[in-house]
C-alpha cells in the first residue's frame, strides 16, 4: 500500500524519501526488509538513515532491494517501503528507459527542463547539463536554480538531457545524475487570451473510491511558440504544493502540444487511492498568459454502480 520505486547509478549518491508521510519532528527508523536489520544513522556509514531520508553515499548495485521505514508518530508506528534499484553505469552514452524520468516538452518561448529529484539533495548551483552526453555550452543555455532554460529553442534541441550536480554531505562530495527526454514544438504564430479545453467549467467527474484518477488541465494560448503560457491545478484555491496531501500530485513539468495549429499546454493532476474527502474539494484548472487568467472548476462525484444485466436470452 505504502511503497515507492527509486533508482540510481552505482558510485553516485542516491537519496530516497520514506513513502509514509509524517511531521518533520517524527523519528523515522529504517530497516533492510529482508533481514529486518536496522540501518544505522551514523553518517560515517556508506548507507545511513537521516529522518525521512535514506542515503546511499555512494550507491552500489548490491544495495538494490526493499527497505522498510517506520515513522514513529506519538500514537502509532507507521510503515512504508522503498523499492530501490541501483544500476551499473552504462559503458556507452545511451541512457536506458528504466533510468529515464518523465519526458517534458517545450517550445521556443517555453523551454524549462527541471532536474528530477534534486530537491532531496544538498547541492549548490550551478547545475551541469548535458545533451546526449555532450556538455551544453553557449549563451543559449542557462542553468537557473534547479532547471535549464534554453533560449530560442529549435527542433534539434530535442533529445535526452542529463543534469549533473554534486551532493555534499559533511564535506564529502558525491556525484548525482538524472536524465529525462525533452521534445520540442516549434511554430510561429500569435498569442491570445487562454481558452481552456478541459475540463469544462463546473464539470463533474465520476470516480470510484479507492481507485486512482487523473484530471487533465488543458488550455490553448494562440498559435505557435508562446512567451508565457502556463497551466496549473489548485485545490480549494490553494497551490498543490501548499496542500498537505501526498496522494494528490501535479505532474512535474508541463506538456505542450499543438492542436489544429494552436499551442496548447496541459498538466495532469494525479489522485491516488481516491477517498471520500477528495469529493469535497474544488479542483481549479488555471490557465495563464500575458493576456490574463482563466479558471475552470471541476468536482469529483462518486460513480454509481451500474446494474450489469445480461443481454442474452
Amino acid at each position: 500500500k505504502f511503497s515507492k520505486q527509486s533508482w540510481g547509478l552505482e558510485n553516485e549518491a542516491l537519496i530516497v524519501r520514506c513513502p509514509r508521510q509524517g511531521k518533520s519532528s517524527y523519528i523515522v527508523d529504517w530497516y533492510y526488509s529482508q533481514t529486518n536489520k536496522s540501518i544505522p544513522t551514523q553518517e560515517r556509514n556508506r548507507v545511513f538513515a537521516s529522518g525521512q531520508l535514506l542515503k546511499f553515499l555512494p550507491a552500489e548495485v548490491a544495495d538494490s532491494g526493499i527497505y522498510t521505514c517506520i515513522v514513529r508518530s506519538p500514537t502509532f508506528n507507521r510503515t512504508g517501503y522503498a523499492n530501490v534499484t541501483i544500476y551499473k553505469k552504462q559503458p556507452d552514452c545511451n541512457v536506458p528507459d528504466y533510468l529515464m524520468y518523465s519526458t517534458v516538452s517545450g517550445s521556443e518561448k517555453n523551454s524549462k527542463i527541471y532536474c528530477p529529484t534534486i530537491d532531496l539533495y544538498n547541492w549548490t548551483a550551478p547545475l551541469e547539463w548535458f545533451k546526449n552526453c555532450q556538455a551544453l555550452q553557449g549563451s543559449r543555455y542557462k542553468a537557473h536554480k534547479s532547471f535549464l532554460v534554453i533560449d530560442n529553442v529549435m527542433t534539434d534541441d530535442a533529445g535526452d538531457y542529463t543534469c549533473k550536480f554534486i551532493h555534499n554531505e559533511n564535506g564529502a562530495n558525491y556525484s548525482v545524475t538524472a536524465t529525462r527526454s525533452f521534445t520540442v514544438k516549434d511554430e510561429q504564430g500569435f498569442s491570445r487570451f487562454p481558452v481552456i479545453r478541459a475540463p469544462a467549467h463546473n464539470e463533474t467527474k465520476e470516480v470510484e473510491i479507492g481507485e486512482n484518477t487523473n484530471l487533465t488541465c488543458s488550455a490553448c494560448f494562440g498559435k505557435g511558440a508562446q512567451f508565457l503560457a502556463t497551466v496549473q491545478w489548485q485545490l480549494n484555491g490553494n497551490k498543490i504544493t501548499d496542500f498537505s496531501e501526498p496522494r494528490i500530485q501535479q505532474e512535474e513539468g508541463q506538456n505542450q502540444s499543438f492542436s489544429n495549429g494552436l499551442a496548447c499546454v496541459n498538466t495532469v493532476l494525479r489522485i491516488a487511492d481516491v477517498k471520500e474527502e477528495d469529493l469535497l474539494l474544488r479542483y481549479d484548472c488555471l490557465a495563464l498568459n500575458l493576456h490574463g487568467l482563466r479558471r475552470h472548476t471541476i468536482r469529483l462525484s462518486r460513480k454509481n454502480p451500474i446494474d450489469h444485466q445480461s443481454t442474452y436470452c
Epitope: Q21, G22, K23, P74, T75, N77, P246, D273, K275, E277
Partner: antibody, heavy 121, light 106 residues
C-alpha cells in the same frame, strides 16, 4: 462523504460495563486510525485512546488504560470501545474521531455525533 | 504529560471586536490544533498545524505561535463565532486538550 455513526445513548449501573460502537463509511476503514475522545464538564475534551484497524494496534492515554478496551471489525468497518467498572465520573459524552490526513496527524477532522453514557443506580 | 492551559476560561466580545485567546503548553510542542464546539454538537476542526484554517472556516480566524505559546485570533467578532474553543497538541503521547475558552457574544 466521510461519516462516523455512533451507537445510541446508554444507561448503565455503577460497576457495570458498556460497549460503544462507531461505524465508518465514505472511506477505506483500514486507511485511518480511529481515535476516541470524551467531553467532561471539568476537563473539557480528553483523549482516551486509538486503534489502527489494519493491524489492531492500540495506543492509550495512561489514565484510561484499565478503563477502556478498543477493537475494530474490518468486515463491518466498525470500531468499538468497551468501558468497564463504570462510575458516575464516566457519565459523559464519548466521541469517535479521525484525522483528515492520517500520516500528518493534522487534527481531528471527522467526528461521530457522540454517545452519552449515563451511570446511575 | 503535556498540560495545556487555555486563557481566559470565559470571555465575551461585541460584534466587530478583535478577539484573542491563548493556549500555553507545559512543554514545547511543534504545532497546535484548535477546535470549535457549540452546545449539543460535535467539535469541529477549526485551525490545524498552528495556522492553517480548516475547510469552511472564515478568513477572520487566524492561528499563530510556537514552542509553549499559541493563540487563536478573530479579527472581527461575529455572532456565529460564539462557542467553546479547544486547543490540542499532537506532539507527545498522551494527546492532550486544553480545558477550553468559552467565547460569548456581548
Amino acid at each position: 462523504q466521510v461519516q462516523l455513526q455512533q451507537s445510541g445513548a446508554e444507561l448503565v449501573r455503577p460497576g457495570a460495563s458498556v460497549t460503544l460502537s462507531c461505524k465508518a463509511s465514505g472511506y477505506t476503514f483500514t486507511d485511518s486510525e480511529m481515535y476516541w475522545v470524551r467531553l467532561t464538564p471539568v476537563h473539557g475534551l480528553e483523549w482516551i485512546g486509538a486503534i489502527d484497524p489494519e493491524t489492531g494496534d492500540t495506543a492509550f492515554n495512561q489514565k484510561f488504560k484499565g478503563k477502556a478496551t478498543l477493537t475494530a471489525d474490518k468486515s463491518s468497518s466498525t470500531a468499538y470501545m468497551e468501558l468497564r467498572s463504570l462510575t458516575s465520573e464516566d457519565s459523559v459524552v464519548y466521541y469517535c474521531t479521525r484525522a483528515f490526513d492520517n500520516d500528518n496527524d493534522d487534527g481531528f477532522a471527522y467526528w461521530g455525533q457522540g454517545t452519552l453514557v449515563t451511570v446511575s443506580a | 504529560q503535556i498540560v495545556m492551559t487555555q486563557s481566559p476560561a470565559i470571555m465575551s466580545a461585541s460584534p466587530g471586536e478583535k478577539v484573542t485567546m491563548t493556549c500555553s503548553a507545559s512543554s514545547s510542542v511543534n504545532y497546535m490544533h484548535w477546535y470549535q464546539q457549540k452546545s449539543g454538537t460535535s467539535p469541529k476542526r477549526w485551525i490545524y498545524d498552528t495556522s492553517k484554517l480548516a475547510s469552511g472556516v472564515p478568513a477572520r480566524f487566524s492561528g499563530s505561535g510556537s514552542g509553549t505559546s499559541y493563540s487563536l485570533t478573530i479579527s472581527s467578532m461575529e455572532a456565529e463565532d460564539a462557542a467553546t474553543y479547544y486547543c490540542q497538541q499532537w506532539s507527545s503521547n498522551p494527546l492532550t486538550f486544553g480545558a477550553g475558552t468559552k467565547l460569548e457574544l456581548k
